[in-house]
């Protein structure tokens, strides 16, 4: 069978090979399509409701004034010329419809580095056959389930027209320290070959780095935070930000009831001072920023000083602020 592709809504003419150019003709067309139960036979005489769908022209060709999805199928013509020689024509008709240009809807203006983000949803409306949607990053195809890329797809069919609407939702996890302004686009590839892809306008969300680049540092004296009973520990909170933010102190995750200060002195250390300490710098723009916690422990006489002590009681000894 010869493959024929026709655009939905357009006319189609199928030639009946070997048929005399004008009547009288001995020919018949047989159709097996979405409109027929089995094989439907059409003759040059025509007439009836089928004339609006398909009719035989004076030259023996079959004419379909406006091809639809239901016209997909097999078309066969059997003709006899004046000498009684029989010729058969066999066509496999497939129909297509190019959708409108795909669009990216619900697109994000900003993505957060290091976590999954919805980039947007690509929508293509009015295709036949369904076709496929694919995503591109900086012009290169994005492969789902690779490097933090995931795609959720949905295909719907219009109950009356039979045309397809495709949706593809893209989720990505941008790498920290990566491109701050990636370019995403989406393209529709038709289900039938020999038709070029349709591409959306690109989108360029910003990538936001959620982690402050410079840590709040907590410096302990003596180093390691292990001290003999009655000794003094000095904790200093170093914040790179300018202007200097307010610094509060925490012990075992609970704020200490002290005025803000970058230095915390624990004089005459006792068991009640043991625990995990951290400092919190408060910035107006990105809120509180906490240091890593350090462990303060007491070394009993004769013990080696550990590099990190165990968490002790929750009471507070005498505190001094520099």
């Amino acid at each position: 069978a010869q493959n024929i592709t026709a655009r939905i809504g357009e006319p189609l003419v199928l030639k009946c090979k070997g048929a005399p150019k004008k009547p009288p003709q001995r020919l018949e067309w047989k159709l097996n399509t979405g409109r027929t139960e089995a094989w439907k036979v059409l003759s040059p005489q025509g007439g009836g409701p089928w004339d609006s769908v398909a009719r035989v022209l004076p030259n023996g060709s079959l004419f379909l004034p406006a091809v639809g999805i239901q016209d997909e199928g097999i078309f066969r013509c059997q003709a006899m010329n004046r000498n009684g020689k029989e010729t058969k024509s066999n066509y496999r008709v497939r129909v297509y419809q190019i959708p409108g240009k795909p669009e990216i809807v619900d697109s994000a203006s900003e993505l957060t580095a290091g976590v999954p983000n919805k980039v947007g949803t690509c929508v293509s409306e009015g295709s036949y056959p369904a076709g496929t949607l694919s995503w591109h990053l900086d012009g290169k195809p994005l492969v789902p389930n690779e490097k933090g890329v995931s795609v959720k797809e949905q295909t719907r069919r219009h109950p009356e027209t039979g045309l397809f609407t495709l949706q593809s939702e893209l989720m990505v996890t941008p790498a920290r320290g990566g491109d701050p302004r990636p370019t995403f686009s989406c393209s529709f590839s038709p289900g039938l070959p020999r038709h070029r892809a349709l591409r959306t306008a690109p989108i360029q969300p910003r990538v936001w780095e959620p982690v402050p680049l410079e840590e709040v540092q907590l410096v302990v004296e003596p180093e390691g935070g292990a001290v003999a009973p009655g000794g003094t520990v000095t904790l200093t909170c170093e914040v790179p930000a300018q202007p200097s933010p307010q610094i509060h102190w925490m012990k075992d995750g609970v704020p200490l009831p002290l005025p803000p200060s970058p230095v915390l002195i624990l004089p005459e250390i006792g068991p009640q001072d043991q625990g995990t300490y951290s400092c919190v710098a408060t910035h107006s723009s990105h809120g509180p920023q906490e240091s890593r916690a350090v462990s303060i422990s007491i070394i009993e006489p004769g013990e080696e000083g550990p590099t990190a002590g165990s968490v002790g009681g929750s009471g507070l000894g005498t505190l001094a602020l520099a």
């Epitope: 959620p210 982690v211 402050p212 609970v254 704020p255 920023q289 240091s291 916690a293």
Partner: nanobody, 118 residues
Framework: EVQLVESGGGLVQAGGSLRLSCAVS????????FGWFRQAPGKEREFVSA????????YYADLVKGRFTISRDNAKNTVYLLMNSLKPEDTAVYYC???????????WGQGTQVTVSS
Amino acid sequence: EVQLVESGGGLVQAGGSLRLSCAVSGRTFSTDAFGWFRQAPGKEREFVSAMRWNGSSSYYADLVKGRFTISRDNAKNTVYLLMNSLKPEDTAVYYCTAGKRYGYYDYWGQGTQVTVSS
């Protein structure tokens, strides 16, 4: 992995209230600090509020102090942001966030839109 899913956003008149919820699931033991940030169209993302999971401390941006309250429900594994006396300038996408400590948030939700009309 920790998953954060925000809900409760919507359209509200100036002076009205909304309560945002952030459902926390996954490896929640790896997080101790939770917060809310927001981003208005064309503006930088900004801090709104943060708290310890145990409720021992909480922080608020100056712009929302006295109007917004952060809280949590341990049984439901949910963090809330109650927003009262809303103003048009509170219009933004609100993001829930979580991390080991304040300021270092490894996990972010997808955001929920809050629109305050005048």
